[in-house]
């Protein structure tokens, strides 16, 4: 055998080159046939009416032909025939790769609630061979479940991802990424998750700055509530007691002027949205006013007083509510 060919892999729409190579040629007739065994080239002449075939080289040692705008119907065995004695035949297989025509991502719900499991589907249509689909949530790879549907030598792959969403997932992209031999670089599509979650409540003492509350001083607490959708109701209540008469409520702020021991107790900020409600508690303890020491007449003494503020976080395990923060000043 002194007739040689090489298999060709080509992307749909691109150019395939078919080469029939002859070692030790005696100038015998050489021809190239298509998978239907129709003659494409007889020597340097193309009897076939398909003008996508063009002669690149014809000599006693080679018949080289290009096929432009390759389609999937061009796939198959192409035969080189050399009419020596005995005649020789060799075939080259053209494999046509078809990149996915379309990449579609579909999320079951536009908006999900934290803790909910949602279904995300990604479909890569009409590729050859079948596409591999990979899933990412942000930079984290996730595992999906793929189904392949074959139709007329083409493959449509649908990958299903079941995703339990958390509040941290809000605004994070879910990425469907395709791996296919006809695709160079990244072919991907993404959708951003929209996750609704109940408020997170945090109490901040904005006055006094040093954190020690004494009789006669003022107290200002600010309630920060973050949720999705943003909480519309932020309310202050005093646990197990009435709110002091001299307390002033202004939106998320609670002001108590001229603190006295009767103000001691737990102050709760409550916030809610359509997902649920949560609260945070602040435990107020009013200290005695500082005692005044008269200055000495002969010697000067510097006294340094160190005040320690302890913030204790207590988790409230009541069902359906966020763990509350109880800030206790000693």
């Amino acid at each position: 055998q002194n007739l040689f060919t090489k298999d060709v892999t080509v992307i749909e729409g691109e150019v395939a080159t078919i080469s029939c190579q002859v070692n030790k040629s005696d100038d015998s007739v050489i021809q190239l046939l298509n998978p239907n065994r129709q003659t494409i080239y007889f020597r340097d002449f193309r009897p076939l009416k398909d003008s996508r075939f063009q002669l690149l080289n014809f000599s006693s040692s080679e018949l080289k032909v290009s096929l432009t705008n390759v389609s999937i119907s061009d796939e198959g065995r192409y035969f080189c025939q050399l009419y020596t004695d005995p005649p020789q035949e060799s075939y080259t297989t053209i494999t046509v790769l078809v990149p996915p025509r379309n990449l579609m991502i579909d999320i079951q719900k536009d908006t999900a609630v934290e803790g909910e499991e949602i279904e995300v589907n990604c479909t890569a249509m009409a590729s050859k061979p079948a596409t591999t689909i990979r899933w990412f949530k942000g930079n984290t790879e996730l595992k999906g479940k793929s189904e392949v549907e074959e139709w007329s030598d083409m493959y449509t792959v649908t990958s299903q991802l079941m995703l339990k969403v958390h509040k941290e997932d809000d605004g994070v992209p879910v990425i469907c990424q395709v791996e296919h031999p006809a695709v160079t670089g990244n072919l991907q599509t993404q959708r951003y998750l929209e996750v609704q979650y109940k408020p997170q409540v945090h109490i901040q003492m904005t006055y006094p700055l040093q954190g020690l509350t004494r009789e006669g001083d003022a107290l200002e607490l600010t309630c920060e509530a973050i949720g999705k959708p943003q909480p519309v109701m932020v309310t202050w209540v005093r646990v197990d007691d009435e709110m002091p008469q001299h307390a002033v409520l202004s939106g998320p702020n609670l002001f108590i002027n001229n603190l006295n021991k009767t103000d001691n107790g737990t102050y709760r900020c409550e916030a809610s949205n359509i997902v649920g409600k949560a609260h945070s508690d602040y435990m107020l303890y009013v200290y005695d006013p500082p005692t005044t020491i008269p200055p000495p007449t002969t010697t000067t003494t510097t006294t340094t007083t160190t005040t320690t503020t302890i913030l204790t976080i207590i988790t409230d395990s009541r069902a359906g509510e966020e763990g509350s923060i109880r800030a206790v000043d000693h």
Epitope: S28, V29, L33, R37, T39, R43, F45, P47, P86
Partner: antibody, heavy 115, light 108 residues
Framework: QVQLQQWGAGLLKPSETLSLTCAFY????????WSWIRQPPGKGLEWIGE???????NYNPSLKSRVTISVDTSKNQFSLKLNSVTAADTAVYYC?????????WGRGTLVTVSS | SSELTQDPAVSVALGQTVRITCQGD??????ASWYQQKPGQAPVLVIY???NRPSGIPDRFSGSSSGNTASLTITGAQAEDEADYYC???????????FGGGTMLTVL
Amino acid sequence: QVQLQQWGAGLLKPSETLSLTCAFYGESFSGYYWSWIRQPPGKGLEWIGEINHSGSTNYNPSLKSRVTISVDTSKNQFSLKLNSVTAADTAVYYCARSSWYFDLWGRGTLVTVSS
Amino acid sequence: SSELTQDPAVSVALGQTVRITCQGDSLRSYYASWYQQKPGQAPVLVIYGKNNRPSGIPDRFSGSSSGNTASLTITGAQAEDEADYYCNSRDSSGNHVVFGGGTMLTVL
């Protein structure tokens, strides 16, 4: 000059064997197919068959049972034998070079079959 | 019966354009070749492939193809173009040669 020269008996009796030879003068005998074509008087062209230098043949299915085409590469010659001739085989017989199309023809030999 | 079909006779006025056609299933895949034959002479190739003329053939001869029909067009026919014209191709397998029945062209 590239040419085809043909010769053979011009008068045959029915049931005899027609025998014609064609010689190619030029380069690349091995690079082509070599055909025989005939034309009955006042009628159209009819392809008989073809051969290449290695002896591979293709024949007209309607004549295949009676036809033999052979080749002698040492002389750049090919020959036609047609058995059991009848008056219907009376025709001008042409040899031709084939590159799929027939780009070179012999001058033709009139073969008459008559008792 | 031929696998390629031609009109038996066509006439054209001197200097006018004439088209000779050839029909057959194999022409869906393959180009036809065209031959001119004058009385007492061997055929001469005038057109082959998509529209190729051998050297020495005037450029008034041209070929075209559509579907299962091949055409030979003579633009500005001359008196010396009066002859029989044969189309030829191979069958779909490529193994057997077929000729049309021939068209007699008369130049008036």
